[in-house]
């Protein structure tokens, strides 16, 4: 496979990974196949350091994540585990709310206006964050 | 010159098998997805599948899905699309097209001029 | 799936007229919209990116507005090399994304 070692035009390098930040809205599944598509995945927040990174970028806008729980517990999409990671819900949150009245509950995490997380309806479009790290090699499937 | 150029179509009977190739010049090839749509006589343009830029992840569209395969070789600059168990309805011209994106963009900005795929007995 | 819809399916127009193409989406679709052309024989070329920006050399004389669910391509004096088949695709859902039927532009 080859290895990435720059950040693709449009990516904002920090920390060994590439960030990308979208300019407008998908709901959750879209924007998890866009960044894939990207060979990419949604931003996975390991850290306050991060955390503060990304806010810093968004700013006071609702923002996906790579964080979700609609297969049961909650998981980020490239493995990171969640029970023993770095979180930053608001408070009471999150609440699977079933009261919004679009059907089910809430299942996707996002960036709220203040940078804490919220649970919220994956159809919702919001922007969202691609990341991909540095130094890692993707791995070419051999053709058949 | 940015170019894409296909090949590989034909005449198969149904249920038979086919493997198309997009061989592609003038840009990193490695760094863009690639897609093939295509356009059944007289009719408009469907998009079929598409594949990351490093080949790990693919989607296809629900009318393929489990009969096509899409991959690409990077070293040799070329997309591929292997049709398997191929019925009337995908006689098409099948075009590659790549992706491009951009803070605002999201749209195919280059295309192929097609190649021929005629499924009949 | 989102399904497209362009009106009209074809139109006759002289050299010199202004013409109209709608797109409209079964859901908001956002400014997700591009337009290609394609003239017989030969793969699209897109003309129009998320809206309004116009793809590096295309005319001026080519314009798209909307947002939402209803967009528009104009063509605002219309030259012999613009008769061909317009189609308009949406890139909100990723990637499935979606083609309109297509709209031919034919000369009256």
């Known amino acids: 496979g080859s290895e990435r070692t720059c950040c693709p035009v449009n990516w904002v390098e920090h920390e060994r990974s590439c960030y990308w930040f979208s300019r407008s809205g998908k709901a959750w599944a879209d924007a998890d196949n866009y960044c894939r598509l990207e060979d990419a995945h949604l931003v996975v927040v390991t850290s306050w350091e991060e955390q503060k990174f990304v806010q810093h970028h968004i700013g006071p806008v609702n923002t996906w994540m790579g964080l979700h729980d609609q297969n049961g517990p909650w998981k980020w999409v490239d493995g990171t585990d969640y029970e023993t990671g770095f979180k930053n819900w608001r408070p009471e949150q999150p609440d699977d709310w079933y009261g919004h009245g679009l059907g089910g509950g809430e299942d996707c995490a996002h960036f709220t206006d203040d940078g804490r997380w919220n649970d919220d309806v994956c159809q919702r479009p919001y922007r969202w964050v691609c990341e991909t790290e540095l130094d890692k090699a993707s791995q070419e499937p051999p053709l058949l | 010159e940015v170019q894409l150029l296909e090949s590989g179509g034909g005449l198969v009977q149904p249920g038979g098998s086919l493997r198309l190739s997009c061989a592609a010049s003038?840009?990193?090839?490695?760094?863009?997805?690639m897609n093939w749509v295509r356009q059944a006589p007289g009719k408009g343009l469907e998009w079929v599948s598409v594949?990351?830029?490093?080949?790990?992840?693919?989607y296809y569209a629900d009318s393929v899905k489990g009969r096509f395969t899409i991959s690409r070789d990077n070293s040799k600059n070329t997309l591929y699309l292997q049709m398997n168990s191929l019925r009337a309805e995908d006689t098409a011209v099948y075009y590659c097209?790549?992706?491009?994106?951009?803070?605002?963009?999201?749209?195919?900005?280059?295309w192929g001029q097609g190649t021929m795929v005629t499924v009949s007995s | 799936d989102i399904q497209m819809t362009q009106s009209p399916s074809s139109l006759s127009a002289s050299v010199g007229d202004r013409v109209t193409i709608t797109c409209r989406a079964s859901?908001?679709?956002?400014?997700?919209l591009n337009w290609y052309q394609q003239k017989p024989g030969k793969g699209p070329k897109v003309l129009i990116f998320?809206?309004?920006s116009l793809q590096s050399g295309v005319p001026s004389r080519f314009s798209g507005s909307g947002s939402g669910t209803d967009f528009t391509l104009t063509i605002s004096s219309l030259q012999p090399e613009d008769f061909a088949t317009y189609y308009c695709?949406?890139?909100?859902?990723?990637?499935?994304?979606?083609f309109g039927q297509g709209t031919k532009v034919e000369i009256k």
């Open positions: 003038g840009f990193t090839f490695s760094s863009y997805a």
């Open positions: 859901q908001n679709i956002n400014n997700y």
């Open positions: 594949i990351s830029g490093s080949g790990s992840n693919t």
């Open positions: 998320t809206t309004s």
């Open positions: 695709q949406q890139s909100y859902t990723t990637p499935t994304w979606t």
């Open positions: 097209a790549k992706r491009y994106t951009s803070d605002w963009h999201d749209a195919f900005d280059i």
